[in-house]
Interface confidence: low
């Protein structure tokens, strides 16, 4: 009968360069119990070759010699005694693209050489890109082990070398960046920058890179209050701003973080559970009133902790003036003068454009004050008789502003016309 | 649109060297092989070698291998071949074409750089 | 090295009329994974080369269909059904199946 002699074996495997390949493959030959029994030799050959003089790419005779080009590379795997004839091909190189031939041998019986059912091995460029791998996510000062590897390659042929780059790696030394392994303990300012791990085969011209960019958690390290786009100034965690009474006001709480943190307004200094006055980083008020002096506090909650900023608001007012107003009393003219601010204003009173400062020694005029509420009243009593046409006026004046009034005593007449100029600092 | 560009002409002296550029555009520059050919003046083309930006693998004609050294900068899509220790044998008119992986062949040539090499 | 050979040299046919070019490997040039690398590029005057057929008879988008490649193993044609006047140049044929790849020494096209 006709020997039998099969070859289960791809037609056609392709591989990048650089990587590996496992090219499973059986084989049966006749043979029979009753002969001797020599030693199982197989072989790959190139095609094209003639078995007898050729180098081998892989065999398990030890006393064949082997492609030097592919020494180390391609290897037989599995049992040849279980007709097992695999195929590992690892650091595949583009020369190692062509067709090979396999070849059983055992005693002087068996020699054949399975040329219908050739492998055709096709390496292509290096498209496969390496993986980097890390728990995610990220934490801002949690040292974290970053690997880089390549899908698909092995340890055949020369060493892989690594070299990683990026930002968040300075200053390591250098050695460090040449490891497949890497432990990084990530900043909050290298979130949003690269990390590259490029590999390259040693003596090889086969070089693959990936870029990942980092997303790094970091809590809020710094809280900015912006208001019309201008950051306010911060000292121990608190921020001071003076505020007109009546006037809209709208604050923005900045905390950079990733995620981006919870911002929220509280009224005063809150408990921890305390509900806020705004679930945003937006404070707006749209008229602030004297009531709401004091402060309110901006804080920025994110899973890795929270930071807080209290805003001292100081509500100021410029001076309002009613008066002055003047009769005629027992004791001689009697002019008052009331007025309103935040902070509380200065007044003077002039006669003529003179200032009247404290009492006259020689008791010509006195000068009263009094306070209700939030405004303050203020008397002037000029006694002796006037001379002529004369103009009183009183002023009331803060850091803010001031503002001042006139009354115009004409003499000989019984109504005293009265004006108002506010003047502004 | 797809387009190579070519620099310009050169002259140079015998024993120097000289860098001819091809910038790529209108297409990913690392999913195409970059080849530069040869053609010498009223003759025919001669392949040199290729280069695939997407690895930075080489491949050169055996001939050509201690004459011409390729390289790229991913940055500017463009791939450089250096050519060393010039002879006159070197004035060429020398082209950069692109290769699909699919083996469809040279689809797009730049406009080709000429080469002068003379004292 | 795969050497490829080219004829005729020079091809002086009237318009309209058929163009043959043949060309010839000095070894098989079917790639080992199983395609055969055979290109034909024309090059007019004063231009770049223009692919014009790849992988034997696979005409490139925007060839015109007067322009047909055939053959196997060594023996590869380019054929020109109808000549017009915008198809004078020098022809090649390539082989990419083998390192190094080369291309054949061209055919001229002129117009009687």
């Known amino acids: 009968e006709k020997p039998v002699y099969e070859l289960q074996v791809q037609k056609s495997v392709t591989v990048q360069e650089g990587l590996c390949v496992l090219v499973p493959c059986s084989f049966s030959y006749p043979w029979r119990s009753w002969y001797s029994s020599p030693p199982l030799y197989v072989y790959w050959f190139r095609d094209g070759e003639i078995p007898y003089y050729a180098e081998v790419v892989a065999t398990n005779n030890p006393d064949r010699r082997v492609k030097p080009e592919t020494q180390g590379r391609f290897r037989l795997l599995g049992d040849v005694q279980k007709k097992n004839c695999s195929l590992s091909i690892g650091d595949a190189r583009m020369e190692d693209t062509g067709s090979y031939f396999f070849r059983v041998e055992r005693g002087r019986d068996v020699k054949y050489s399975y040329q219908q059912n050739k492998l055709n091995l096709e390496v292509t460029a290096l498209i496969e890109k390496p993986d980097i791998h890390f728990l995610e996510p990220l934490e801002s000062g949690r040292p974290t082990r970053l690997s880089c590897s390549l899908p698909g390659s092995c340890e055949a042929g020369p060493p892989l070398t690594f070299s990683w780059t990026g930002n968040a790696l300075s200053p390591l030394d250098p050695e460090t960046t040449r490891s497949s392994e890497l432990t990084l303990t990530p900043r909050p300012e290298d979130h949003g920058t690269n990390l590259t791990c490029q590999m390259k085969r040693q003596g090889a011209q086969v070089t693959t890179e990936r870029t990942v960019q980092l997303n790094v958690s970091y809590a809020p390290q710094t809280i900015t209050i912006f208001r019309n786009g201008i950051a306010l100034e911060i000292l121990q965690n608190t921020s001071y701003l003076p505020v007109l009474e009546g006037q809209a006001l709208r604050l923005l709480c900045d905390a950079p973080s990733n995620p981006p943190a919870h911002l929220s307004w509280f009224q005063g200094s809150p408990a921890l559970n305390a509900t806020p006055i705004s679930n945003t980083g937006i404070l707006e008020l749209r008229r602030v009133r004297s009531a709401e002096e004091g402060g309110f506090t901006c804080r920025a909650q994110h899973p890795l902790g929270f930071l807080q900023i209290f805003l001292n608001l100081s509500v100021y007012s410029l001076p309002q003036l009613l008066g002055p107003s003047c009769s005629w009393e027992a004791e001689g003219l009697h002019c008052r003068c009331s007025f309103r601010a935040r902070p509380a204003p200065s007044l003077c009173w002039r006669l003529e454009e003179k200032p009247l400062e404290g009492n006259s020694s020689q008791g010509s005029f006195k000068v009263n004050s009094s306070s209700a509420g939030p405004w303050a009243n203020s008397s002037l009593i000029l006694h002796g008789g006037l001379s002529s046409d004369l103009k009183v006026s009183c002023k009331a004046w803060n850091i803010y502003g001031s503002q001042s009034g006139s009354v115009l005593l004409l003499q000989g007449r019984s109504n005293l016309g009265t004006g108002v100029v506010p003047a502004a600092l | 649109q797809v387009q190579l560009q070519q620099s310009g002409a050169e002259l140079v002296k015998p024993g120097a060297s000289v860098k001819l550029s091809c910038k790529a555009s209108?297409?990913?520059?690392?999913?195409?092989?970059i080849h530069w050919v040869k053609q010498r003046s009223g003759q025919g083309l001669e392949w040199i070698g290729w280069?695939?930006?997407?690895?930075?693998?080489?491949k050169y004609n055996e001939k050509f291998k201690d004459k011409a050294t390729l390289t790229a900068d991913k940055s500017s899509s463009t791939v450089y071949m250096e050519l060393s220790r010039l002879t006159s044998e070197d004035s060429a008119v020398y082209f950069c074409?692109?290769?699909?992986?699919?083996?469809?062949?040279?689809?797009?040539w730049g406009q080709g750089t000429t080469l002068t090499v003379s004292s | 090295d795969v050497l490829m050979t080219q004829t005729p040299l020079s091809l002086l046919v009237s318009l309209g009329d058929q163009a043959s070019i043949s060309c010839r490997s000095s070894?098989?040039?079917?790639?080992?994974?199983?395609?055969?690398?055979l290109e034909w590029y024309l090059q007019k005057p004063g231009q770049s080369p223009k692919l014009l057929i790849y992988?034997?008879?696979i005409r490139f988008s925007g060839v015109p269909d007067r322009f047909s490649g055939s053959g196997s193993g060594t023996d590869f044609t380019l054929k020109i059904s109808r000549v017009e006047a915008e198809d004078l140049g020098v022809y090649y044929c390539?082989?990419?199946?083998?390192?190094?790849?080369?291309f054949g020494g061209g055919t001229k096209l002129e117009i009687k």
């Open positions: 074409a692109r290769q699909e992986e699919g083996g469809i062949g040279f689809d797009y």
């Open positions: 209108g297409y990913t520059f690392t999913e195409y092989t």
């Open positions: 280069f695939y930006p997407g690895s930075g693998s080489i």
């Open positions: 070894q098989s040039i079917v790639h080992s994974n199983g395609n055969t690398y």
């Open positions: 992988k034997v008879s």
């Open positions: 390539f082989q990419g199946s083998h390192v190094p790849w080369t």
